[in-house]
C-alpha cells in the first residue's frame, strides 16, 4: 500500500476554498522530491494540475498553490474559488504521476446555498458582527417585531421590540427599527459564537397577517494560514480584526492541546516567559490592526497561534480571531550564533550578528529590547555612522568579518548593560537574531589607565596591559568614532608586570601620540583580534589641555585619573533620542526612508534563543 496519506473525501460548496494536506514519510529523498496534485481521467491517466516544481495548470491559474513542509512530511494544496466543475477524483503524490506513491482524494463541490424558501444567507466570521435585515409591510409598522432561532423543531425567541433578550445573547444583541420612511427592522448580533449559527426567522406582527423572513446564519471558524519559517529566524503575525474592535485589548495566544489558548503577549502587558527578549507587539493602527514579531524561533514555537480582541486580553467565546499554523524548519539557512554572551563589569563583549549574505550592502542595526508595555527595541547603533549619545566611546558596529556576519563591540560594561539585544538589517526581515548579554563576576582582562589628560604639543604614551591568555592574538590600539575604530600605530613594550601569575607571554602595548593637538581628544580603545574576529577591548578617554610645563606624559596605571563613576557619566548624557524599532512594515515597502533612525523597523529585529551556545566576552 502507498505510504501517502490524506483526506479520502473532501466536500465543499461553490465559491469556497479547500486546503488539502497530504502526509508522506519524511525521508531525505521524499522531502526533496517532486510533489504533485493531479486529476484522474476516465481512462486512468492523471493530469497534473499543480506541482512543487512551479507548474500550475491554466485551470488553476491564480486560485491554487502547493506548499511543501519537508520538516513535517506534509504538503498542502490550496484551491480557491471552487466550482462544481472541480468535483472529481484526484491524487496527491510524490515523484512521477504514474508511480505508486500517491493517495486518492475525492472532491465534491455542491451548489452554494441559494435563496431557497426566501432565505437570506449570512456568512460571517467567528467573533464578528452580523446585521439581519427584516422587511415588513405598513400594516405591521406598529406591531411587535421579533427574531426567533429554530432549535430542532421549535422556534425560540431571541429578541423582540418589547425589550426581551434571550439570555444566550445578553450584552451582544440589539433590535433597531429604522425611521418611519423605511419599512425595515434590523437585528445586530455582536461577538458571534459558533453556537449562533443556524436558521432564524424574523417577524413583524403576531397574527396571520404578520410579515416573516427567513435567515440562515453561517458562522465560520478561520482556517489557519500556514506559515513556514526557519529555525533561529523570525515570524511576523499581522492581525487585522477590524475597526469595531479598535479599542478592545488585543492578544496573541498559542493553542495547547484542548481548548486552552495560552497568551503569548497582549496589550494589557502580559507576556509569556518563554518569549522574553524575543517578542514585540507593534502598536496598533487606528483600524485596530497590529502585528507581533517573534524572533529566535525555536522548534517548540511551532503550533497554532490565534490573535484576537477581548477586554480580558485572552481568548473568550465570541472573540474575533485570526489563526496561523506555524511550522519551524530545522533545515535552517540561518547559522547558529551564540545566544548568550558574558562579560564582566568594566569589561567588554564582542557580539557576532548574522545577516543574509546576499544583502551585504544593507544597513545593519543593533537595538536593546525593552520589555515595558508591549515591548520595543530602541536603536543603539547603525552601520551608517550613528551611535546613540549615551553609548559614544563604548559601542561600535563593524562590518567585519563580512560575508554574512557583522560585529558589535560594547565596552565599559556595567550591570545595566545586561539584557537582550537584537541584530537586524533593513533587508531580509527573517534574519533577525538576538543575544542576551549577562554581566558576571570577574575583572576585565585588559588593563588600561582611567581617563587621561594630554598636553597640547607634547607627547602622550598610554599603556594597555594584555594578559598571557592573549599571547596568540593580534593586539591593537584604535581611535573610536561613530563610524568605527580607526587603527593607530602602537609599540610592544615587552612583558607586562600588571598580572600576578602571568608569565613572559603577557604584554604591555602602548599608544603614542606625538605633538598632541585638539583633534587627538576622544576615546581610544585597545583590544585583541584574530583576523577579522574581534575579542575584548578596553577604552580610555584622552582629554587635551593647554601646556603648563614642558615635557612629555607617560601615563601609568597608578598615575592615571580614576575613571569617573557611572553617576558622573550619566550626568553628562543628553536626552535619549527616540529611535525605537516598532513598525515591521517600514522596510517592507520599497521606498526611500528619509531617516530610519526615527522610524526603524521592528520586524527587522530578531532574537536567537534557539540554541544554548554561549560566547564569552571578558573573563568568565
Amino acid at each position: 500500500k502507498s505510504p501517502i496519506f490524506g483526506p479520502e473525501e473532501v466536500n465543499s460548496v461553490e465559491g469556497n476554498s479547500v486546503s488539502i494536506t497530504c502526509y508522506y514519510p519524511p525521508t531525505s529523498v521524499n522531502r526533496h522530491t517532486r510533489k504533485y496534485w493531479c486529476r484522474q481521467g476516465a481512462r486512468g491517466g492523471c493530469i497534473t494540475l499543480i506541482s512543487s516544481e512551479g507548474y500550475v495548470s491554466s485551470k488553476y491559474a491564480g486560485r491554487a498553490n502547493l506548499t511543501n513542509f519537508p520538516e513535517n512530511g506534509t504538503f498542502v494544496v490550496n484551491i480557491a474559488q471552487l466550482s462544481q466543475d472541480d468535483s472529481g477524483r484526484y491524487k496527491c503524490g510524490l515523484g512521477i504521476n504514474s508511480r505508486g506513491l500517491s493517495f486518492d482524494v475525492s472532491l465534491e463541490v455542491s451548489q452554494g446555498p441559494g435563496l431557497l424558501n426566501d432565505t437570506k444567507v449570512y456568512t460571517v466570521d467567528l467573533g464578528r458582527t452580523v446585521t439581519i435585515n427584516c422587511p415588513f409591510k405598513t400594516e405591521n409598522a406598529q406591531k411587535r417585531k421579533s427574531l426567533y432561532k429554530q432549535i430542532g423543531l421549535y422556534p425560540v425567541l431571541v429578541i423582540d421590540s418589547s425589550g426581551y433578550v434571550n439570555p444566550n445573547y445578553t450584552g451582544r444583541i440589539r433590535l433597531d427599527i429604522q425611521g418611519t420612511g423605511q419599512l425595515l427592522f434590523s437585528v445586530v448580533i455582536n461577538q458571534l459564537r459558533l453556537s449562533d449559527a443556524g436558521q432564524y426567522l424574523c417577524q413583524a406582527g403576531d397574527d396571520s397577517n404578520s410579515n416573516k423572513k427567513n435567515a440562515d446564519l453561517q458562522v465560520l471558524k478561520p482556517e489557519p494560514e500556514l506559515v513556514y519559517e526557519d529555525l533561529r529566524g523570525s515570524v511576523t503575525f499581522h492581525c487585522a480584526l477590524g475597526p469595531e474592535v479598535a479599542n478592545v485589548a488585543k492578544f496573541l495566544c498559542r493553542q495547547s492541546s484542548g481548548e486552552n489558548c495560552d497568551v503569548v503577549v497582549n496589550t494589557l502587558g502580559k507576556r509569556a516567559p518563554a518569549f522574553e527578549g524575543r517578542i514585540l507587539l507593534n502598536p496598533q493602527d487606528k483600524d485596530g490592526s497590529f502585528s507581533v514579531v517573534i524572533t529566535g524561533l525555536r522548534k517548540e514555537d511551532a503550533g497554532r497561534y490565534l490573535c484576537g480582541a477581548h477586554s480580558d486580553g485572552q481568548l473568550q467565546e465570541g472573540s474575533p480571531i485570526q489563526a496561523w499554523q506555524l511550522f519551524v524548519n530545522e533545515e535552517s539557512t540561518i547559522p547558529r550564533s551564540p545566544t548568550v554572551v558574558k562579560g564582566v563589569a568594566g569589561g567588554s563583549v564582542a557580539v557576532l550578528c548574522p545577516y543574509n549574505r546576499k544583502e551585504s550592502k544593507s544597513i545593519k542595526y543593533w537595538c536593546l529590547w525593552e520589555g515595558a508595555q508591549n515591548g520595543r527595541c530602541p536603536l543603539l547603533v547603525d552601520s551608517e555612522g550613528w551611535v546613540k549619545a549615551q553609548y559614544e566611546g563604548r559601542l561600535s558596529l563593524l562590518e567585519e568579518p563580512g560575508n554574512g556576519t557583522f560585529t558589535v563591540i560594547l565596552n565599559q560594561l556595567t550591570s545595566r548593560d545586561a539584557g537582550f539585544y537584537w541584530c537586524l538589517t533593513n533587508g531580509d526581515t527573517l534574519w533577525r537574531t538576538t543575544v542576551e548579554i549577562k554581566i558576571i563576576e570577574g575583572e576585565p582582562n585588559l588593563k588600561v589607565p582611567g581617563n587621561v589628560t594630554a598636553v597640547l604639543g607634547e607627547t602622550l604614551k598610554v599603556p594597555c596591559h594584555f594578559p598571557c591568555k592573549f599571547s596568540s592574538y593580534e593586539k591593537y590600539w584604535c581611535k573610536w568614532n561613530n563610524t568605527g575604530c580607526q587603527a593607530l600605530p602602537s609599540q610592544d613594550e615587552g612583558p607586562s608586570k600588571a598580572f600576578v601569575n602571568c608569565d613572559e607571554n603577557s604584554r604591555l602595548v602602548s599608544l603614542t601620540l606625538n605633538l598632541v593637538t585638539r583633534a587627538d581628544e576622544g576615546w581610544y580603545w585597545c583590544g585583541v583580534k584574530q583576523g577579522h574576529f574581534y575579542g575584548e577591548t578596553a577604552a580610555v578617554y584622552v582629554a587635551v589641555e593647554e601646556r603648563k610645563a614642558a615635557g612629555s606624559r607617560d601615563v601609568s596605571l597608578a598615575k592615571a585619573d580614576a575613571a569617573p563613576d557611572e553617576k558622573v557619566l550619566d550626568s553628562g548624557f543628553r536626552e535619549i533620542e527616540n529611535k525605537a524599532i516598532q513598525d515591521p512594515r517600514l522596510f517592507a515597502e520599497e521606498k526611500a526612508v528619509a531617516d530610519t533612525r526615527d522610524q526603524a523597523d521592528g520586524s527587522r529585529a530578531s532574537v536567537d534563543s534557539g540554541s544554548s551556545e554561549e560566547q564569552g566576552g571578558s573573563s568568565r
Epitope: 496519506f5 473532501v10 446555498p113 467567528l126 453561517q218 465560520l220 493553542q255 481548548e259
Partner: nanobody, 126 residues
Amino acid sequence: QVQLVESGGGLVQAGDSLRLSCAASGRTFPTYAMGWFRQAPGKEREFVATIRWSGSTQYKYYADFVKGRFTISRDNAKNTVYLQMDSLKPEDTAVYYCAATTLLGDPRALNEYAYWGQGTQVTVSS
C-alpha cells in the same frame, strides 16, 4: 470542557452493520475535528476515521483497513459524529473511542486529540 459520549456498540454477526454515535457537549469551541479510534484486547489504540470541518467544507480521513466499509459523517446541529460500519469482520472487534481535537495536525496521531470518550464495545462474531 468538552464531553464525548459514544453509543451504538453491541454484538453482531460477521457481515452485519452497526452505526456508532458520538455526541459532544459542553464548550465545543474551538473543536475542528472529531474521529474514531479503536483498541482490540492486547493491542494499541489505532486510528479508524476522522472528519474535520471548516465552515461549509469538510474532510474525511480513513484508515486503510476500513476503506470502503466504514463511513464517517456528522450532524452539525446535534454536535454528533457517526461511524457507519458495514461488512463487519471478526477482526473489527474492539472498544471504539470517539475523540475530538482543536489542533490541526496529522489526523491519525493519538496525541493530536485532547478529548476522549469512555468507549463503546463492538464485538463481531464469526
